[in-house]
Amino acid sequence: EVEKTACPSGKKAREIDESLIFYKKWELEACVDAALLATQMDRVNAIPFTYEQLDVLKHKLDELYPQGYPESVIQHLGYLFLKMSPEDIRKWNVTSLETLKALLEVNKGHEMSPQVATLIDRFVKGRGQLDKDTLDTLTAFYPGYLCSLSPEELSSVPPSSIWAVRPQDLDTCDPRQLDVLYPKARLAFQNMNGSEYFVKIQSFLGGAPTEDLKALSQQNVSMDLATFMKLRTDAVLPLTVAEVQKLLGPHVEGLKAEERHRPVRDWILRQRQDDLDTLGLGLQGGIPNGYLVLDLSMQEALS
């Protein structure tokens, strides 16, 4: 806490300029009017203040706006934003996408800080849902943003926003998240033709059920192995050898290299060896000829 001292004669700041870097902490406190600082916040980012001086400037704004800064000030915080605590940010009401962009720009190239996470949370809650423009902005700055949300939070993403999602935005999503996103993507892209649809839906397929994979296998999509390996195991297991062959097209040869990894390994164990042999890939571990396969899960369901 900086002591309240009178401003020395002739040192009262008329504007926020570089002369202030020569002021001691107490002089800044005494000689810079908080209202002047608020109206000229944009100048702070072009002046080489010390960290200590920035702490004083922040303190002045905190005193002027104890209930939280107005958006006109927030938008021009620049690197002073990095001095804010999540508690400070929780007092803000940020509604403009331009303000959000300005503050994200300050932290660009670095992982999401607690300040940024709080800011985004406040912004999205204020909007009520993750609209397309917001999602566009957030994923541009933080490609992994979508996958940092819980399935519950993802449920508020409208299907129209899915158009903003790029494949790399889903890289770190787990199956639970893709389970939520896939139906939205299916809805968003439903009016596209076969090949275009597959290009768009491909990165969401980790949430696809068996029946959708079966449908895709009838459309000559030539799914690559990387996508296949991300499919839900429970969705892949019921697929027949013929369906997987159609689904992968020329990429079917890649199954050999993945035969020890899920979901390929588990799928092989469920196929007849005779059927696997038709692929000519030397896949081993299928059900030997003459063996009867009982679907115990079906039996349990009936009883």
Partner: antibody, heavy 119, light 107 residues
């Protein structure tokens, strides 16, 4: 006068960890940000990380993100660099350096401590 | 990330020469550029900050200029003590990037 003295360097095997320290004196340590900069043998300078005065803001070069952690103890006037999962390419002289603000250069440097990652 | 490119990488000169080293930033950094001098086995030493401001105690034969993306360091009357490697560096709120260095050696 300002003095920065690094310690903790040495020879370490790939995959192992090491912690460097930098003892500061001659200025108000808690007022300024501290950086680590490294220099591989015969190569140029590479900025590694910075920690702001109060310790909550930390930023890293992409080459060390997720492996190195910068920290400070303002009560002891000491800066640290925890280096995990070390690689041969981390072999370098590590310098600590001070900056006084977000738009300030590195005005004081220590003499450096050598870290060699080798099996 | 902002990339800094220095040229030349090596410069041969004689005592008394005027030497110029160039530094180019991959995007505008306003005037937030510093120049450092480093001698073998020693820590770097700050010469110039904010593109053209001379650090206290640095001889006036060193000068810097430029803004935006193009910067130069000039040594007007090269002295025996000036043979060293020089680095430019951009600095902003949370990161610093160095140029690859320019070695000034005796011709």
């Amino acid at each position: 006068q300002v003095q920065l003295v690094e310690s903790g360097g040495g020879v370490v095997q790939p995959g192992r960890s090491l912690r460097l320290s930098c003892a500061a004196s001659g200025f108000t340590f808690s007022s300024d940000a501290m950086n680590w900069v490294r220099q591989a043998p015969g190569k140029g300078l590479e900025w590694v990380a910075v920690i702001w005065n109060e310790g909550s803001n930390k930023y890293y070069a992409d080459s060390v993100k997720g492996r190195f952690t910068i920290s400070r103890d303002n009560s002891k006037n000491t800066l640290y660099l925890q280096m995990n999962s070390l690689r041969a390419e981390d072999t370098a002289v590590y310098y600590c350096a001070r900056d006084r603000g977000p738009l300030w250069p590195l005005d004081y440097w220590g003499q450096g401590t050598l870290v060699t990652v080798s099996s | 990330d902002i990339q800094m490119t220095q040229s030349p990488s090596t410069l041969s000169a004689s005592v008394g020469d005027r030497v110029t080293i160039t530094c180019r930033a991959s995007q505008s950094i306003s005037r937030w550029l510093a120049w450092y001098q480093q001698k073998p086995g020693k820590a770097p030493k700050l010469l110039i900050y904010k593109a053209s401001s001379l650090e206290s105690g640095v001889p006036s034969r060193f000068s810097g200029s430029g803004s935006g993306t193009e910067f130069t360091l000039t040594i007007s009357n090269l002295q025996p003590d000036d043979f060293a490697t020089f680095y430019c560096q951009q600095y902003n709120a949370y990161s610093r990037t160095f140029g690859q260095g320019t070695k000034v050696e005796i011709k």
